[in-house]
Interface confidence: medium
């Protein structure tokens, strides 16, 4: 029985040209994490495998950095990076847990404008 839950950073926004950390956390299970996949729609960005270590997709290696932890750092963001990201935890014996993050990359001026209206 799968008892675990994935907590994510949820819906996040970041400024064009900046960086963002995608984070997921698996809790409420004693299952062993054997691999974490980070995927964006139809593309796999990176894997962190217990045996193989980190492996970044060649097409993203200049803009994606592993970590912190099992998270993923996206750099030099463009508006095209807007969209859904999935953290996929392969565990034993539970199976697969998936978390979803929606990232919106904003033009610099929009991000600054929006910041004025954020509740502290």
């Amino acid at each position: 029985m799968m008892t675990g839950t994935i907590e994510t950073t949820g819906n996040i926004s970041a400024e064009k040209g900046g960086s963002i950390i995608l984070q997921c956390h698996l809790s409420s299970t004693t299952a062993q994490v054997t691999q974490v996949n980070w995927e964006q729609q139809d593309q796999l960005l990176a894997i962190c495998n217990a045996d193989l270590g980190w492996h970044i997709s060649p097409s993203f290696k200049d803009r994606v950095a592993p970590g912190p932890g099992l998270g993923l750092t996206l750099q030099s963001l463009t508006v095209n990076d807007t969209g859904e990201y999935f953290c996929i935890y392969h565990t034993y014996p539970d199976g697969t847990y998936t978390g979803r993050i929606f990232l919106e990359v904003l033009e610099s001026s929009v991000a600054e404008h929006g910041a004025r209206f954020q509740i502290p």
Epitope: E39, L52, S57, I88, Y97, T98
Partner: antibody
């Protein structure tokens, strides 16, 4: 263009070891995983394991854990598979493949295979 | 490990006929979170390494003729050749790439009458 060049056919004695090589060219060797697949004459495909040339990390099919050892030399862009304590069951063609796990494809590049024959 | 079971083990058809082969996995290859299916189909001709035909259960690899179609659910998958050609003589393998080890099915041998 991308190429995987494998070492030539081997005739080896039972109880000995053999090391098969897979030389990669036409791409950045550390950017892609290399996997190995076994095929006995007239039989199906068996997945042996995979190596991350960037980190040296490996993941094996449990069946081959005591049989195969995967290594990689980044300086020469060569992946190796050593098979130990050879028996007639190890007589097979061994393929290396560039493991492209990122959205557009899986294993688009394979080596031609190396025939290993174990015979007294 | 995920066990992949293919059927039939062989089939013989005439050129122009439609062919369907099956692959069943012992565990689901569907990730419910992103709705991806981690199943691939390969074609292997005598004396050659395998060639990727289909990935994601239904996406044709670049350059693969559109007579090859993959479909299926989380555990039951099908490869269909709509109109078999003489050059399709080969063994067809399915493969799990959901989790290590990336197990293959035992293959379906296609013969042309």
């Amino acid at each position: 263009q991308v190429q995987l060049q494998q070492s030539g056919a081997e005739l080896v004695r039972p109880g000995t070891s053999v090391k098969v090589s897979c030389k990669a060219s036409g791409y950045a060797f550390s950017d892609y995983l290399i996997e190995w697949v076994k095929q006995r004459p007239g039989q199906g495909l068996e997945w042996i394991g995979v190596i991350n040339p960037g980190s040296g990390g490996t993941n094996y099919n449990e069946k081959f854990k005591d049989k195969a050892t995967l290594t990689a030399d980044k300086s020469s862009s060569i992946a190796y598979m050593q098979l130990s304590s050879l028996t007639s069951d190890d007589s097979a063609v061994y393929f290396c493949a560039r493991f492209h796990y990122y959205g557009s494809s899986l294993f688009p590049y394979w080596g031609p295979g190396t025939l290993v024959t174990v015979s007294a | 490990d995920i066990v992949m079971t293919q059927s039939p083990s062989s089939l013989s058809v005439s050129a122009g006929e439609k062919v369907t082969m099956s692959c069943k996995s012992s565990q689901s290859l569907l990730n419910s979170g992103n709705q991806k299916k981690y199943l691939a189909w390969y074609q292997q001709k005598p004396g050659q390494p395998p060639k990727l035909l289909i990935y994601g259960a239904s996406t044709r690899e670049s350059g693969v003729p559109d007579r090859f179609t993959g479909s299926g659910s989380g555990t039951d998958f099908t490869l269909t050749i709509s109109s078999v050609q003489a050059e399709d003589l080969a063994v067809y393998y399915c493969q799990n790439y959901h989790r290590f080890p990336f197990t293959f099915g035992s293959g379906t041998k296609l013969e042309i009458k």
